[in-house]
Interface confidence: low
């Protein structure tokens, strides 16, 4: 499958529009601070070069790898050292070290201004004036803020973004039509980015084997009627796709993802009965649909797992002959029978099974040793079940905002060294598990909740990795991918933490809070709550609730006052004094 010119091959496979969009995403994900116009210039240069290679694959430089071509282009940016500091040193390296160097400098939390949404009329005018530039800007702004966003999926988001503007800018009430669609895209986009970030972390921090295990479990749940060999083939192909995207090889990734979707649809009879509708859609929608497709029904009369994996006299023989294949079969068989389990739970069970076989297959009587292995699974299954039950009860009792606050307090006490914005962001997202998953019946709660929590805790891990401040976070994040959530759940109050000095400035509020959206106002209050806990980590729930209730009343009162600023200044001082007294600060 060797091509004389890789760049010509990808240009022909993907078409000019997708080629340009993917190169823009790639460059924006690497050079996150560069202005839009600079990126467009680089993309146009690469595209013109690609066209010369399509015309003549033997032309000068057309035989170079995509990493070499793109890296060379990125290294022409004159302001590289001024803007990116030591990232400029990457340019002195040869491939593949240069690309690895660029990857290491991707920033999960770039210092970029918040995206402010202009007025609807302004957006519609910009869309009509220059549709192409408008959509490119969308790709650029998302890609630079989410340097691991799944590139072919971002093309799908851009297509929906374009459709929303095409439809709504002609509507009688543009805002009523457009704003809910943009909100939905924003929320789905954040979720998609976080899910992909976990896949990349899994590959980069824990290796291909960890990712493949995750994929075996998830695809076996989704396609329980497919044979193990079929699932294995899909896992291999999916691993290649995600390895490419996480490695910045976006053209190859998008091309291979399209090939995988094509293969799945051509072989849907041996994969799943749920794929029919997906496979009738155009490419981007098709790939998205397959990725989100519901689990197929489990085959009837599946035999007991014990026969092959506990009772058989060949267990150790089969394990010794091909360890990963045998463990893969175990995971496949267990997962296809348990759509009610989270993927991480299935991986914990497989790890327990592997550990038991490692120990027992070297023992005098292996069968006697591993005969009770399935009994070891019981506590592993019950732990997330109980946790989800308790937290869903708490969520139903408190509602989302107060449930988030309970988690804010819980996590601030566990890891008070973590920055306040990170604690607020992560705890708010953890709290969303309630409205996302607690509405589901028992059989769907665990896969929804625990796999979502894995995604959110990965956000904490990648943000913390940038500026590590807590050994406990580092430990939970690096020891085991599948045990991250149990590790964080098991953390108690950090007794070694020295409370933060009280700073009245942190609790000084102004009239601008009155004009904020409900969400932004919540974030302000939750920021204050985290700071309170950092000052007084031993404060009781009741004490914190009293202070927060007073705070809510204070904001409400001053926002209704004629002279808001004076009210905030005077009443604020009283509130701080009262809070200090209540908490013994």
């Amino acid at each position: 499958d060797a091509h004389k010119s890789e760049v010509a091959h990808r240009f022909k496979d993907l078409g000019e529009e997708n080629f340009k969009a993917l190169v823009l995403i790639a460059f924006a994900q690497y050079l996150q601070q560069c202005p839009f116009e600079d990126h467009v210039k680089l993309v146009n240069e690469v595209t013109e070069f690609a066209k010369t290679c399509v015309a003549d694959e033997s032309a000068e430089n057309c035989d170079k790898s995509l990493h070499t071509l793109f890296g060379d282009k990125l290294c022409t940016v004159a302001t590289l050292r001024e803007t990116y500091g030591e990232m400029a040193d990457c340019c002195a390296k040869q491939e593949p070290e240069r690309n690895e160097c660029f990857l290491q400098h991707k920033d999960d939390n770039p210092n970029l201004p918040r995206l402010v949404r202009p007025e609807v009329d302004v957006m519609c005018t910009a869309f009509h004036d220059n549709e192409e530039t408008f959509l490119k800007k969308y790709l650029y702004e998302i890609a630079r803020r989410h340097p691991y966003f799944y590139a072919p999926e971002l093309l799908f988001f851009a297509k929906r973004y374009k459709a929303a503007f095409t439809e709504c800018c002609q509507a009688a009430d543009k805002a009523a039509c457009l704003l809910p669609k943009l909100d939905e895209l924003r929320d789905e986009g954040k979720a998609s980015s976080a899910k992909q970030r976990l896949k990349c972390a899994s590959l980069q921090k824990f290796g291909e084997r960890a990712f493949k295990a995750w994929a075996v479990a998830r695809l076996s749940q989704r396609f329980p009627k497919a044979e193990f060999a079929e699932v294995s083939k899909l896992v291999t192909d999916l691993t290649k796709v995600h390895t490419e995207c996480c490695h910045g090889d976006l053209l190859e990734c998008a091309d291979d993802r399209a090939d995988l979707a094509k293969y799945i649809c051509e072989n849907q009879d041996s994969i799943s009965s749920k794929l029919k509708e997906c496979c009738e859609k155009p490419l981007l929608e098709k790939s998205h649909c397959i990725a989100e497709v519901e689990n197929d029904e489990m085959p009837a009369d599946l035999p007991s797992l014990a026969a092959d994996f506990v009772e058989s006299k060949d267990v150790c023989k089969n394990y010794a002959e091909a360890k990963d294949v045998f463990l893969g079969m175990f995971l496949y068989e267990y997962a296809r029978r348990h759509p009610d389990y989270s993927v991480v739970l299935l991986l914990r069970l497989a790890k327990t099974y592997e550990t038991t076989l490692e120990k027992c297959c070297a023992a005098a009587d292996p069968h006697e040793c591993y005969a009770k292995v399935f009994d070891e699974f019981k506590p592993l299954v019950e732990e997330p079940q109980n946790l989800i039950k308790q937290n869903c009860e708490l969520f139903e009792q408190l509602g989302e905002y107060k449930f988030q606050n309970a988690l804010l307090v819980r996590y601030t006490k566990k890891v008070p060294q973590v920055s306040t914005p990170t604690l607020v962001e992560v705890s708010r997202n953890l709290g969303k598990v309630g409205s996302k998953c607690c509405k589901h019946p028992e059989a769907k709660r665990m896969p929804c909740a625990e796999d979502y929590l894995s995604v959110v805790l990965n956000q904490l891990c990648v943000l913390h990795e940038k500026t590590p401040v807590s050994d406990r976070v580092t430990k939970c994040c690096t020891e085991s991918l599948v045990n991250r959530r149990p590790c964080f759940s098991a953390l108690e109050v950090d007794e070694t933490y020295v409370p933060k000095e009280f700073n009245a400035e942190t609790f000084t509020f102004h009239a601008d809070i009155c004009t904020l959206s409900e969400k932004e106002r919540q974030i302000k209050k939750q920021t204050a709550l985290v700071e309170l806990v950092k000052h007084k980590p031993k404060a009781t729930k009741e004490q914190l609730k009293a202070v927060m209730d007073d705070f809510a009343a204070f904001v409400e009162k001053c926002c209704k006052a004629d002279d808001k600023e004076t009210c905030f200044a005077e009443e604020g001082k009283k509130l701080v004094a009262a809070s200090q007294a209540a908490l013994g600060l």
Epitope: N61, D72, K73, C75, T76, V77, A78, T79, L80, R81, A88, D89, C90, C91, A92
Partner: nanobody, 115 residues
């Protein structure tokens, strides 16, 4: 094999001028941005100036702005640094690098500004 060979250094009086050259080989010179970097005795390397692959875009460290000019000739695979109004603090070994790296990959050329 990537090779960068600098020349044009020497001893010059304060206020004088020098033109440094850097001959490149072993890579597609016209595809890369290039930089000049200097290292004074007993100090770490200091980035001086950079130019993009086409020569259209240039950038300078504050300490040399208005006095130094970076240029390139892609046909000759050569990078230049025109240094005017030289000061004693410009004394250093000057070397060219690919991109804007400050990791030294060549011998460099000595520039000494002294009366």
């Amino acid at each position: 094999q990537v090779q960068l060979v600098e020349s044009g250094g020497g001893l010059v009086q304060p206020g004088g001028s020098l033109r440094l050259s850097c001959a490149a080989s072993g890579f597609t010179f016209g595809s890369f941005g290039m930089s000049w970097v200097r290292q004074a005795p007993g100090k770490g390397p200091e980035w001086v100036s950079a130019i993009d692959s086409s020569g259209a875009d240039t950038i300078y460290a504050e300490s040399v702005k208005g006095r130094f000019t970076i240029a390139r000739d892609n046909a000759k695979k050569t990078l230049y640094l025109q240094m005017n109004s030289l000061k004693p603090e410009d004394t250093a070994v000057y070397y060219c690098t690919i991109g804007q790296s400050i990791s030294r990959g060549s011998q460099g050329t000595q520039v000494t500004v002294s009366s």
